[in-house]
């Protein structure tokens, strides 16, 4: 998970989400994606 | 209820093998997807990688990749997780998991059953 510090002074914190293709269609490997998982 | 067994531990070199199982029973198999997590001492419990429903597809954590392979029989209801190459790094306790099908594959919470863990031991 990567941690960014804005000036803000909050942290956001993203996190990388990674679903099998076969459960949202018909294709075959993984799908990447990015999820902001929010402020603490 | 679905319920997870796993087998195959034990203490083993570095650079040997072991092949763990998860026997999955209580449950439709072809309908959930499995994943395989470890937890060292005094850390958090992490995702090693995980196996498509149909057994197609799999997804490994970098720090396995190219060393560790998930398979499943649907025959045996059985997931495997074969370790190669294995590293002192590798020593944890390992666990199966399942999920429903659309969650995210390398996330804990995504996962609603867990086997008891068996342990690992890489000794150098």
């Known amino acids: 998970d990567a941690e960014f510090r804005h000036d803000s002074g909050y942290e956001v914190h993203h996190q990388k989400l990674v679903f099998f293709a076969e459960d949202v269609g018909s294709n075959k490997g993984a799908i990447i994606g990015l999820m902001v998982g929010g402020v603490v | 209820e679905v319920q997870l067994v796993e087998s195959g531990g034990g203490l083993v070199q570095a650079g040997g093998s072991l092949r763990l199982s998860c026997a999955v029973s209580g449950g439709t198999f072809s309908s959930i997807g499995m994943g395989w997590f470890r937890q060292a001492p005094g850390k958090e419990r992490e995702f090693v990688g995980a196996i498509s429903r149909s057994g197609d597809s799999t997804y490994y954590a970098d720090s396995v990749k190219g060393r560790f392979t998930i398979s499943r029989d649907g025959a045996k209801n059985t997931v495997y997780l074969q370790m190669n190459s294995l590293k002192d790094e590798d020593t944890a306790v390992y666990y199966c998991?399942?999920?429903?099908?659309?969650?995210?594959?390398?996330?804990?919470?995504?996962?609603?059953?867990w086997g008891q863990g068996t342990q690992v031991t890489v000794s150098s």
């Open positions: 998991a399942g999920r429903p099908a659309g969650t995210a594959i390398n996330i804990r919470r995504s996962y609603n059953y």
